[in-house]
Protein backbone atom coordinates (compact mmCIF):
# COMPACT_ATOMS: atom_id res chain seq x y z
CA UNK A 1 0.00 0.00 0.00
CA UNK A 2 1.21 3.40 -0.86
CA UNK A 3 1.12 6.19 1.92
CA UNK A 4 0.50 9.88 1.32
CA UNK A 5 3.65 10.86 -0.66
CA UNK A 6 5.29 14.05 -1.21
CA UNK A 7 7.84 15.27 -3.61
CA UNK A 8 10.64 14.23 -1.73
CA UNK A 9 9.90 10.42 -1.17
CA UNK A 10 9.10 9.90 -4.94
CA UNK A 11 11.36 12.58 -6.56
CA UNK A 12 14.10 10.32 -6.63
CA UNK A 13 12.03 7.49 -7.80
CA UNK A 14 11.05 9.82 -10.69
CA UNK A 15 14.30 9.92 -11.84
CA UNK A 16 14.55 6.54 -13.31
CA UNK A 17 10.88 6.23 -14.12
CA UNK A 18 11.19 8.71 -17.35
CA UNK A 19 10.96 5.18 -19.60
CA UNK A 20 7.68 3.67 -21.02
CA UNK A 21 7.40 1.69 -18.34
CA UNK A 22 4.21 1.21 -16.76
CA UNK A 23 3.78 2.73 -13.64
CA UNK A 24 4.09 0.33 -10.20
CA UNK A 25 1.06 0.95 -8.59
CA UNK A 26 2.21 2.41 -5.39
CA UNK A 27 4.20 5.01 -7.30
CA UNK A 28 3.37 8.87 -6.77
CA UNK A 29 4.45 11.12 -8.67
CA UNK A 30 6.62 14.36 -7.85
CA UNK A 31 4.99 17.12 -6.31
CA UNK A 32 1.90 14.88 -5.60
CA UNK A 33 0.56 13.58 -2.60
CA UNK A 34 -1.48 9.97 -3.04
CA UNK A 35 -3.32 7.59 -1.00
CA UNK A 36 -3.91 4.31 -2.33
CA UNK A 37 -6.59 3.91 0.40
CA UNK A 38 -8.15 6.63 -0.78
CA UNK A 39 -7.56 6.01 -4.63
CA UNK A 40 -6.83 9.84 -4.65
CA UNK A 41 -3.81 11.55 -6.06
CA UNK A 42 -3.58 15.36 -5.15
CA UNK A 43 -0.85 17.49 -7.68
CA UNK A 44 -2.87 21.04 -6.34
CA UNK A 45 -1.30 24.48 -6.18
CA UNK A 46 2.37 22.86 -8.00
CA UNK A 47 2.43 25.21 -10.92
CA UNK A 48 2.88 21.37 -12.69
CA UNK A 49 3.28 22.75 -16.69
CA UNK A 50 1.49 19.51 -18.29
CA UNK A 51 0.12 16.53 -16.87
CA UNK A 52 2.37 13.61 -14.94
CA UNK A 53 3.55 10.85 -16.84
CA UNK A 54 3.25 8.90 -14.27
CA UNK A 55 0.22 8.51 -12.09
CA UNK A 56 -0.26 5.45 -10.01
CA UNK A 57 -2.86 2.93 -11.69
CA UNK A 58 -5.34 2.52 -8.84
CA UNK A 59 -6.17 6.92 -9.25
CA UNK A 60 -10.37 7.46 -8.79
CA UNK A 61 -9.59 10.64 -8.11
CA UNK A 62 -7.20 13.26 -9.32
CA UNK A 63 -6.82 16.73 -8.37
CA UNK A 64 -4.86 18.89 -10.88
CA UNK A 65 -6.02 21.90 -9.89
CA UNK A 66 -4.30 25.43 -9.36
CA UNK A 67 -1.58 24.74 -11.62
CA UNK A 68 -0.17 26.51 -15.11
CA UNK A 69 -0.99 23.40 -17.88
CA UNK A 70 -1.77 25.72 -20.54
CA UNK A 71 -2.76 22.97 -23.49
CA UNK A 72 -4.47 19.99 -22.83
CA UNK A 73 -3.28 17.81 -25.71
CA UNK A 74 -4.83 14.72 -27.26
CA UNK A 75 -4.62 11.87 -24.90
CA UNK A 76 -3.39 13.44 -22.05
CA UNK A 77 -4.39 11.27 -19.73
CA UNK A 78 -3.65 8.12 -21.94
CA UNK A 79 -1.30 5.95 -20.64
CA UNK A 80 -0.36 2.17 -20.89
CA UNK A 81 -1.76 0.25 -19.67
CA UNK A 82 -4.81 2.75 -19.53
CA UNK A 83 -6.05 4.89 -16.03
CA UNK A 84 -9.05 2.89 -16.40
CA UNK A 85 -10.24 3.31 -12.49
CA UNK A 86 -10.31 7.09 -13.16
CA UNK A 87 -13.43 8.47 -12.10
CA UNK A 88 -13.54 12.26 -11.48
CA UNK A 89 -10.73 14.53 -12.58
CA UNK A 90 -10.56 18.10 -11.26
CA UNK A 91 -8.37 20.69 -13.76
CA UNK A 92 -10.12 23.95 -12.11
CA UNK A 93 -7.75 26.69 -11.92
CA UNK A 94 -5.09 25.55 -13.90
CA UNK A 95 -4.60 28.76 -16.58
CA UNK A 96 -6.04 26.13 -19.05
CA UNK A 97 -6.16 28.02 -21.99
CA UNK A 98 -6.45 24.94 -25.02
CA UNK A 99 -8.25 21.97 -24.49
CA UNK A 100 -7.50 19.99 -27.49
CA UNK A 101 -9.81 17.04 -29.58
CA UNK A 102 -9.31 13.61 -27.45
CA UNK A 103 -7.94 15.33 -24.43
CA UNK A 104 -10.05 13.28 -22.22
CA UNK A 105 -9.53 9.75 -24.63
CA UNK A 106 -8.61 6.38 -23.39
CA UNK A 107 -10.74 7.14 -19.96
CA UNK A 108 -13.27 4.70 -19.66
CA UNK A 109 -14.66 5.24 -16.07
CA UNK A 110 -14.33 9.12 -16.10
CA UNK A 111 -17.91 10.13 -14.92
CA UNK A 112 -16.73 13.62 -13.68
CA UNK A 113 -14.81 17.00 -14.87
CA UNK A 114 -14.44 19.59 -13.66
CA UNK A 115 -12.79 22.35 -16.07
CA UNK A 116 -13.60 25.71 -14.07
CA UNK A 117 -11.60 28.49 -13.45
CA UNK A 118 -9.67 28.43 -16.75
CA UNK A 119 -9.79 30.72 -19.25
CA UNK A 120 -10.30 28.37 -22.66
CA UNK A 121 -9.49 30.47 -25.59
CA UNK A 122 -10.06 27.07 -27.24
CA UNK A 123 -12.25 24.24 -27.14
CA UNK A 124 -12.07 21.75 -29.64
CA UNK A 125 -15.57 20.55 -30.48
CA UNK A 126 -14.12 17.29 -30.05
CA UNK A 127 -13.10 17.50 -26.38
CA UNK A 128 -15.43 15.58 -25.34
CA UNK A 129 -16.45 13.03 -27.84
CA UNK A 130 -12.72 11.92 -28.86
CA UNK A 131 -13.44 11.85 -32.59
CA UNK A 132 -14.96 13.99 -35.76
CA UNK A 133 -17.28 10.89 -36.21
CA UNK A 134 -21.61 12.42 -36.59
CA UNK A 135 -21.95 9.56 -33.86
CA UNK A 136 -19.23 8.78 -31.59
CA UNK A 137 -19.01 6.59 -28.71
CA UNK A 138 -21.05 7.67 -25.87
CA UNK A 139 -18.45 9.40 -23.42
CA UNK A 140 -18.96 7.84 -19.85
CA UNK A 141 -19.18 11.23 -18.18
CA UNK A 142 -21.79 12.19 -15.93
CA UNK A 143 -20.91 15.70 -14.52
CA UNK A 144 -19.79 18.33 -16.21
CA UNK A 145 -18.37 21.34 -14.64
CA UNK A 146 -17.26 24.43 -16.76
CA UNK A 147 -18.00 27.76 -14.26
CA UNK A 148 -16.47 30.43 -15.41
CA UNK A 149 -14.30 29.17 -18.65
CA UNK A 150 -14.72 32.33 -20.69
CA UNK A 151 -11.26 33.86 -21.65
CA UNK A 152 -10.83 37.45 -21.42
CA UNK A 153 -11.87 39.21 -24.25
CA UNK A 154 -8.57 40.02 -25.80
CA UNK A 155 -8.36 36.30 -25.86
CA UNK A 156 -11.44 35.56 -27.57
CA UNK A 157 -11.28 33.68 -30.73
CA UNK A 158 -13.70 35.23 -34.09
CA UNK A 159 -16.25 32.68 -33.24
CA UNK A 160 -19.09 33.42 -30.24
CA UNK A 161 -17.70 31.52 -27.18
CA UNK A 162 -21.69 30.50 -26.66
CA UNK A 163 -20.86 28.85 -30.03
CA UNK A 164 -17.80 27.31 -29.58
CA UNK A 165 -18.66 25.66 -26.10
CA UNK A 166 -22.01 24.37 -27.66
CA UNK A 167 -20.10 22.89 -30.43
CA UNK A 168 -18.14 20.79 -28.04
CA UNK A 169 -21.18 19.83 -26.03
CA UNK A 170 -22.92 18.01 -28.57
CA UNK A 171 -20.09 16.63 -30.93
CA UNK A 172 -21.01 13.14 -31.68
CA UNK A 173 -23.73 12.82 -29.50
CA UNK A 174 -21.17 11.61 -27.12
CA UNK A 175 -22.65 13.51 -23.55
CA UNK A 176 -26.41 11.87 -24.15
CA UNK A 177 -25.21 10.55 -20.62
CA UNK A 178 -24.51 13.63 -18.89
CA UNK A 179 -26.93 13.97 -15.71
CA UNK A 180 -25.09 17.59 -14.76
CA UNK A 181 -23.85 20.26 -16.30
CA UNK A 182 -22.72 23.95 -15.02
CA UNK A 183 -21.92 26.51 -16.67
CA UNK A 184 -22.52 29.59 -14.75
CA UNK A 185 -20.64 32.81 -14.83
CA UNK A 186 -19.56 32.66 -18.31
CA UNK A 187 -20.97 35.50 -19.47
CA UNK A 188 -23.46 33.46 -22.33
CA UNK A 189 -25.35 36.10 -24.14
CA UNK A 190 -27.93 33.10 -25.22
CA UNK A 191 -27.96 29.67 -25.32
CA UNK A 192 -27.55 28.19 -28.77
CA UNK A 193 -30.75 26.30 -29.40
CA UNK A 194 -29.48 23.00 -30.50
CA UNK A 195 -27.35 22.20 -26.92
CA UNK A 196 -30.23 20.76 -24.80
CA UNK A 197 -32.06 18.53 -27.24
CA UNK A 198 -28.32 16.96 -27.41
CA UNK A 199 -28.41 16.27 -23.74
CA UNK A 200 -31.74 14.61 -23.16
CA UNK A 201 -30.29 12.70 -19.31
CA UNK A 202 -30.00 16.37 -17.85
CA UNK A 203 -30.81 16.46 -14.31
CA UNK A 204 -29.34 19.27 -13.24
CA UNK A 205 -28.44 22.59 -15.11
CA UNK A 206 -26.79 25.55 -13.80
CA UNK A 207 -26.75 28.37 -16.31
CA UNK A 208 -26.63 31.28 -13.68
CA UNK A 209 -24.32 34.31 -13.43
CA UNK A 210 -24.23 35.16 -17.34
CA UNK A 211 -26.17 37.40 -19.34
CA UNK A 212 -28.82 35.67 -21.06
CA UNK A 213 -32.09 38.03 -22.25
CA UNK A 214 -34.28 35.74 -23.19
CA UNK A 215 -34.76 31.90 -23.72
CA UNK A 216 -37.05 32.33 -26.66
CA UNK A 217 -35.29 30.14 -28.95
CA UNK A 218 -34.08 27.32 -26.05
CA UNK A 219 -36.22 24.59 -26.18
CA UNK A 220 -36.70 22.52 -22.70
CA UNK A 221 -39.12 19.82 -23.50
CA UNK A 222 -37.16 16.66 -24.00
CA UNK A 223 -35.49 17.64 -20.87
CA UNK A 224 -37.95 14.88 -18.85
CA UNK A 225 -35.51 14.11 -16.03
CA UNK A 226 -34.67 17.80 -15.40
CA UNK A 227 -34.57 18.38 -11.70
CA UNK A 228 -33.03 21.52 -11.22
CA UNK A 229 -32.89 24.67 -13.48
CA UNK A 230 -30.43 27.49 -12.31
CA UNK A 231 -30.90 30.74 -14.08
CA UNK A 232 -30.51 33.05 -11.42
CA UNK A 233 -28.45 36.59 -11.91
CA UNK A 234 -28.78 36.71 -15.54
CA UNK A 235 -30.29 39.35 -17.81
CA UNK A 236 -33.87 37.74 -18.27
CA UNK A 237 -37.12 40.16 -18.78
CA UNK A 238 -39.62 38.20 -19.51
CA UNK A 239 -40.46 34.56 -19.83
CA UNK A 240 -42.81 33.96 -22.69
CA UNK A 241 -45.75 31.69 -22.84
CA UNK A 242 -43.97 28.54 -24.71
CA UNK A 243 -41.10 27.91 -22.76
CA UNK A 244 -43.51 28.70 -19.55
CA UNK A 245 -45.58 26.00 -20.54
CA UNK A 246 -42.54 23.82 -21.50
CA UNK A 247 -40.94 24.15 -17.79
CA UNK A 248 -44.28 23.14 -16.56
CA UNK A 249 -44.36 20.21 -18.44
CA UNK A 250 -41.07 18.78 -16.87
CA UNK A 251 -42.39 16.63 -14.45
CA UNK A 252 -39.67 16.79 -11.56
CA UNK A 253 -38.08 20.56 -12.04
CA UNK A 254 -37.43 23.16 -9.62
CA UNK A 255 -36.42 26.38 -11.48
CA UNK A 256 -34.31 29.14 -9.86
CA UNK A 257 -35.00 32.92 -11.40
CA UNK A 258 -33.21 34.66 -8.51
CA UNK A 259 -32.04 38.17 -9.34
CA UNK A 260 -32.90 39.35 -13.18
CA UNK A 261 -34.15 42.42 -14.18
CA UNK A 262 -38.08 41.33 -14.94
CA UNK A 263 -39.56 44.23 -16.51
CA UNK A 264 -42.97 44.25 -15.83
CA UNK A 265 -45.05 45.42 -18.56
CA UNK A 266 -47.66 44.32 -20.64
CA UNK A 267 -45.42 41.62 -21.91
CA UNK A 268 -45.19 40.10 -17.86
CA UNK A 269 -48.86 39.54 -17.64
CA UNK A 270 -48.73 35.74 -18.59
CA UNK A 271 -46.01 34.95 -16.29
CA UNK A 272 -47.40 36.71 -13.70
CA UNK A 273 -50.44 34.10 -13.85
CA UNK A 274 -47.96 31.08 -14.28
CA UNK A 275 -46.12 32.19 -10.72
CA UNK A 276 -48.92 32.54 -8.96
CA UNK A 277 -50.52 28.94 -9.69
CA UNK A 278 -47.36 27.01 -10.42
CA UNK A 279 -45.16 25.22 -7.95
CA UNK A 280 -41.80 24.61 -9.96
CA UNK A 281 -40.48 28.19 -9.34
CA UNK A 282 -38.32 27.95 -6.09
CA UNK A 283 -38.40 31.37 -3.81
CA UNK A 284 -41.30 32.71 -6.27
CA UNK A 285 -41.87 35.48 -3.44
CA UNK A 286 -38.84 36.95 -3.94
CA UNK A 287 -39.17 37.69 -7.43
CA UNK A 288 -39.45 41.82 -8.37
CA UNK A 289 -39.45 43.76 -11.16
CA UNK A 290 -36.69 46.28 -12.06
CA UNK A 291 -38.35 48.23 -14.70
CA UNK A 292 -40.30 50.17 -15.89
CA UNK A 293 -39.11 52.85 -12.57
CA UNK A 294 -42.32 52.99 -11.31
CA UNK A 295 -42.67 49.25 -10.77
CA UNK A 296 -39.11 49.18 -9.15
CA UNK A 297 -39.01 46.55 -6.45
CA UNK A 298 -42.64 45.61 -6.75
CA UNK A 299 -43.11 42.12 -6.03
CA UNK A 300 -44.31 39.97 -9.13
CA UNK A 301 -46.78 37.72 -7.14
CA UNK A 302 -48.36 40.91 -6.06
CA UNK A 303 -49.27 42.05 -9.53
CA UNK A 304 -52.37 42.19 -11.31
CA UNK A 305 -53.26 43.04 -15.05
CA UNK A 306 -54.20 46.61 -13.87
CA UNK A 307 -50.50 47.05 -12.87
CA UNK A 308 -49.07 45.27 -16.37
CA UNK A 309 -49.23 47.95 -19.11
CA UNK A 310 -47.35 49.04 -22.10
CA UNK A 311 -46.72 52.65 -23.08
CA UNK A 312 -48.92 53.42 -26.24
CA UNK A 313 -46.71 53.68 -29.38
CA UNK A 314 -46.83 56.79 -30.75
CA UNK A 315 -47.33 57.28 -34.70
CA UNK A 316 -44.48 58.21 -36.58
CA UNK A 317 -45.36 61.84 -37.18
CA UNK A 318 -45.67 62.47 -33.28
CA UNK A 319 -42.24 60.41 -32.27
CA UNK A 320 -39.35 62.71 -31.25
CA UNK A 321 -35.68 61.70 -31.76
CA UNK B 1 -29.39 9.86 -0.10
CA UNK B 2 -27.87 6.38 0.34
CA UNK B 3 -29.17 4.41 3.80
CA UNK B 4 -28.26 1.21 5.28
CA UNK B 5 -29.41 -1.28 7.25
CA UNK B 6 -27.77 -4.16 8.79
CA UNK B 7 -28.81 -7.38 10.59
CA UNK B 8 -27.62 -10.77 11.66
CA UNK B 9 -27.54 -12.64 15.35
CA UNK B 10 -26.50 -11.06 17.53
CA UNK B 11 -25.62 -13.76 20.58
CA UNK B 12 -23.00 -16.39 19.25
CA UNK B 13 -20.96 -18.67 21.18
CA UNK B 14 -17.19 -19.17 21.46
CA UNK B 15 -15.60 -20.70 18.12
CA UNK B 16 -18.83 -19.89 16.09
CA UNK B 17 -18.85 -17.28 12.79
CA UNK B 18 -20.18 -14.28 13.32
CA UNK B 19 -22.28 -13.27 9.84
CA UNK B 20 -24.23 -10.12 9.64
CA UNK B 21 -25.20 -8.28 6.00
CA UNK B 22 -25.97 -4.43 5.34
CA UNK B 23 -28.98 -3.57 2.88
CA UNK B 24 -28.21 -0.42 0.65
CA UNK B 25 -31.21 1.79 -0.14
CA UNK B 26 -31.38 4.59 -2.17
CA UNK B 27 -28.31 4.54 -4.10
CA UNK B 28 -26.15 3.11 -6.91
CA UNK B 29 -23.89 0.42 -6.00
CA UNK B 30 -20.62 1.98 -8.07
CA UNK B 31 -18.73 4.67 -6.57
CA UNK B 32 -18.96 3.25 -2.90
CA UNK B 33 -16.88 1.31 -0.95
CA UNK B 34 -18.44 -0.43 1.48
CA UNK B 35 -16.78 -0.99 4.77
CA UNK B 36 -17.22 -2.68 8.32
CA UNK B 37 -16.29 -1.49 11.59
CA UNK B 38 -16.65 -2.36 15.56
CA UNK B 39 -16.99 -0.37 18.76
CA UNK B 40 -15.95 -3.16 21.95
CA UNK B 41 -17.86 -1.85 25.22
CA UNK B 42 -16.97 1.76 26.62
CA UNK B 43 -13.95 1.64 23.95
CA UNK B 44 -13.14 3.27 20.42
CA UNK B 45 -14.06 2.27 16.95
CA UNK B 46 -11.68 0.07 14.92
CA UNK B 47 -12.14 -0.38 11.06
CA UNK B 48 -12.73 -4.17 9.85
CA UNK B 49 -12.07 -4.35 6.08
CA UNK B 50 -13.94 -3.12 2.77
CA UNK B 51 -14.98 -4.34 -0.48
CA UNK B 52 -15.94 -2.25 -3.59
CA UNK B 53 -18.31 -2.88 -5.88
CA UNK B 54 -16.32 -4.71 -8.36
CA UNK B 55 -15.47 -7.37 -5.05
CA UNK B 56 -11.68 -5.84 -4.73
CA UNK B 57 -11.47 -6.20 -0.43
CA UNK B 58 -8.97 -4.53 1.92
CA UNK B 59 -8.57 -6.04 5.53
CA UNK B 60 -7.57 -5.19 8.67
CA UNK B 61 -4.13 -7.58 9.02
CA UNK B 62 -5.30 -8.44 13.19
CA UNK B 63 -8.01 -9.68 11.76
CA UNK B 64 -7.60 -11.20 7.83
CA UNK B 65 -7.07 -14.48 8.84
CA UNK B 66 -10.64 -14.73 9.83
CA UNK B 67 -12.75 -12.21 8.52
CA UNK B 68 -14.54 -12.18 4.83
CA UNK B 69 -16.27 -9.54 3.39
CA UNK B 70 -18.36 -10.07 0.04
CA UNK B 71 -21.05 -8.04 -1.98
CA UNK B 72 -24.10 -8.83 -4.06
CA UNK B 73 -24.90 -6.84 -6.23
CA UNK B 74 -27.93 -7.81 -7.51
CA UNK B 75 -29.30 -7.18 -3.82
CA UNK B 76 -27.33 -4.31 -2.68
CA UNK B 77 -26.31 -6.04 -0.06
CA UNK B 78 -22.63 -6.67 1.19
CA UNK B 79 -21.61 -9.08 4.18
CA UNK B 80 -19.55 -9.72 6.89
CA UNK B 81 -18.31 -12.86 8.51
CA UNK B 82 -16.02 -13.24 10.99
CA UNK B 83 -14.75 -17.31 11.92
CA UNK B 84 -13.74 -18.56 15.46
CA UNK B 85 -15.45 -15.39 17.73
CA UNK B 86 -14.01 -15.46 20.55
CA UNK B 87 -15.40 -12.67 23.96
CA UNK B 88 -12.86 -10.35 22.92
CA UNK B 89 -15.36 -9.97 19.72
CA UNK B 90 -18.29 -8.27 21.53
CA UNK B 91 -18.71 -5.05 19.93
CA UNK B 92 -21.27 -3.26 18.29
CA UNK B 93 -20.84 -3.31 14.38
CA UNK B 94 -21.52 -0.96 12.21
CA UNK B 95 -21.58 -1.26 8.06
CA UNK B 96 -20.47 1.81 6.40
CA UNK B 97 -20.18 3.32 3.45
CA UNK B 98 -17.97 6.22 1.82
CA UNK B 99 -18.40 7.69 -1.89
CA UNK B 100 -15.46 8.23 -3.40
CA UNK B 101 -15.95 9.87 -6.60
CA UNK B 102 -17.80 13.57 -5.75
CA UNK B 103 -16.62 16.91 -5.80
CA UNK B 104 -16.78 17.28 -2.28
CA UNK B 105 -16.69 13.00 -1.78
CA UNK B 106 -15.43 11.91 1.59
CA UNK B 107 -12.67 10.07 2.70
CA UNK B 108 -14.60 9.14 6.16
CA UNK B 109 -17.75 6.91 6.01
CA UNK B 110 -20.09 9.01 5.30
CA UNK B 111 -22.87 6.73 5.87
CA UNK B 112 -23.29 4.04 8.55
CA UNK B 113 -25.68 1.90 9.60
CA UNK B 114 -27.85 1.52 12.81
CA UNK B 115 -25.43 -0.81 14.58
CA UNK B 116 -25.49 -4.63 15.59
CA UNK B 117 -24.65 -5.63 18.99
CA UNK B 118 -23.04 -8.63 18.69
CA UNK B 119 -22.13 -10.72 22.11
CA UNK B 120 -20.10 -13.84 22.55
CA UNK B 121 -20.48 -16.05 25.16
CA UNK B 122 -20.79 -19.75 26.22
CA UNK C 1 0.27 0.86 10.51
CA UNK C 2 -0.71 4.02 10.90
CA UNK C 3 -1.11 4.97 14.62
CA UNK C 4 -3.49 8.70 15.56
CA UNK C 5 -3.40 9.77 18.96
CA UNK C 6 -5.63 12.03 20.01
CA UNK C 7 -5.39 14.87 23.22
CA UNK C 8 -6.39 15.34 25.46
CA UNK C 9 -8.61 12.28 26.15
CA UNK C 10 -11.06 14.23 28.17
CA UNK C 11 -12.25 17.83 27.68
CA UNK C 12 -14.49 19.77 29.94
CA UNK C 13 -15.58 23.35 28.74
CA UNK C 14 -19.13 25.56 29.05
CA UNK C 15 -21.20 26.05 26.10
CA UNK C 16 -20.27 29.21 24.42
CA UNK C 17 -16.50 28.37 25.29
CA UNK C 18 -13.99 27.58 22.22
CA UNK C 19 -12.96 23.46 22.33
CA UNK C 20 -9.68 22.88 20.73
CA UNK C 21 -9.41 18.86 19.50
CA UNK C 22 -5.56 17.19 18.83
CA UNK C 23 -4.58 14.55 17.01
CA UNK C 24 -0.94 13.15 15.90
CA UNK C 25 -0.29 10.91 13.32
CA UNK C 26 2.42 8.14 13.58
CA UNK C 27 3.71 9.13 10.05
CA UNK C 28 2.19 11.52 7.30
CA UNK C 29 -1.38 11.29 6.42
CA UNK C 30 -1.27 14.19 4.02
CA UNK C 31 -4.77 15.52 4.10
CA UNK C 32 -6.24 12.41 4.28
CA UNK C 33 -7.89 12.81 7.63
CA UNK C 34 -11.45 12.88 8.58
CA UNK C 35 -13.25 13.51 12.24
CA UNK C 36 -16.50 12.09 13.80
CA UNK C 37 -18.53 12.89 16.43
CA UNK C 38 -20.66 10.04 18.25
CA UNK C 39 -23.58 10.59 20.93
CA UNK C 40 -24.70 7.10 23.43
CA UNK C 41 -26.23 4.75 21.38
CA UNK C 42 -25.67 6.47 18.19
CA UNK C 43 -23.29 5.82 15.10
CA UNK C 44 -20.58 8.35 14.23
CA UNK C 45 -21.49 11.41 12.65
CA UNK C 46 -19.02 12.69 9.83
CA UNK C 47 -17.75 16.33 10.76
CA UNK C 48 -14.69 17.22 8.75
CA UNK C 49 -13.02 15.25 5.49
CA UNK C 50 -9.95 15.99 3.65
CA UNK C 51 -8.79 17.43 6.64
CA UNK C 52 -10.42 20.52 6.21
CA UNK C 53 -13.65 20.38 4.67
CA UNK C 54 -17.12 20.34 6.05
CA UNK C 55 -19.44 17.32 5.33
CA UNK C 56 -22.81 18.29 4.31
CA UNK C 57 -24.95 20.03 6.67
CA UNK C 58 -22.24 20.23 9.68
CA UNK C 59 -22.15 24.13 11.20
CA UNK C 60 -20.14 26.29 10.31
CA UNK C 61 -18.54 26.41 13.93
CA UNK C 62 -17.04 23.41 13.33
CA UNK C 63 -13.75 23.94 11.36
CA UNK C 64 -10.77 21.51 11.00
CA UNK C 65 -7.33 22.27 10.06
CA UNK C 66 -3.84 20.57 9.55
CA UNK C 67 -1.63 18.18 7.09
CA UNK C 68 1.34 15.88 7.30
CA UNK C 69 1.03 14.50 11.34
CA UNK C 70 -0.69 17.14 13.02
CA UNK C 71 -4.33 18.11 13.16
CA UNK C 72 -6.96 20.16 15.04
CA UNK C 73 -10.81 20.36 15.41
CA UNK C 74 -12.12 23.42 16.46
CA UNK C 75 -15.81 24.07 17.80
CA UNK C 76 -15.96 27.85 17.82
CA UNK C 77 -18.79 27.94 20.68
CA UNK C 78 -19.83 25.05 21.62
CA UNK C 79 -23.57 24.08 21.79
CA UNK C 80 -25.64 22.08 24.32
CA UNK C 81 -25.32 19.34 21.41
CA UNK C 82 -21.80 18.94 21.07
CA UNK C 83 -21.00 17.23 24.04
CA UNK C 84 -19.94 13.73 23.16
CA UNK C 85 -16.94 11.85 21.64
CA UNK C 86 -14.56 12.71 18.59
CA UNK C 87 -12.82 10.58 16.87
CA UNK C 88 -10.11 11.17 14.08
CA UNK C 89 -9.71 8.98 11.26
CA UNK C 90 -6.87 8.45 8.56
CA UNK C 91 -7.01 7.01 4.90
CA UNK C 92 -4.19 7.57 3.90
CA UNK C 93 -3.18 3.69 4.39
CA UNK C 94 -4.73 0.71 4.90
CA UNK C 95 -5.23 -0.61 7.38
CA UNK C 96 -7.64 2.73 7.97
CA UNK C 97 -7.30 3.47 11.78
CA UNK C 98 -9.05 5.54 14.27
CA UNK C 99 -7.65 7.61 17.34
CA UNK C 100 -8.97 6.76 20.75
CA UNK C 101 -10.98 9.38 21.22
CA UNK C 102 -11.34 12.34 23.06
CA UNK C 103 -14.20 13.07 25.37
CA UNK C 104 -16.14 16.90 25.01
CA UNK C 105 -18.05 16.97 28.62
CA UNK C 106 -19.76 19.68 30.17
CA UNK C 107 -18.08 21.40 32.87
Known amino acids: TSSASSSSSSAPFLASAASAQPPLPDQCPALCECSEAARTVKCVNRNLTEVPTDLPLYVRNLFLTGNQLAVLPAGAFARRPPLAELAALNLSGSRLDEVRGGAFEHLPSLRQLDLSHNPLAYLSPFAFSGSNASISAPSPLVELILNHIVPPDDKRQNRSFEGMVAAALVAGRALQGLHLLELASNHFLYLPRDVLAQLPSLRYLDLSNNSLVSLTYVSFRNLTHLESLHLEDNALKVLHNGTLAELQGLPHVRVFLDNNPWVCDCHMADMVTWLKQTGVVQGKDRLTCAFPEKMRNRVLLELNSADLDCDPILPPSLQTS | QVQLQQWGAGLLKPSETLSLTCAVY????????WSWIRQPPGKGLEWIGE???????NYNPSLKSRVTISVDTSKNQFSLKLSSVTAADTAVYYCAAWFGELWDYYYGMDVWGQGTTVTVSS | EIVLTQSPATLSLSPGERATLSCRASQSVSSFLAWYQQKPGQAPRLLIYDASNRATGIPARFSGSGSGTDFTLTISSLEPEDFAVYYCQQRSNWPLTFGQGTRLEIK
Open chain 2, 26 to 33: GGSFSGYY
Open chain 2, 51 to 57: IDHSGST
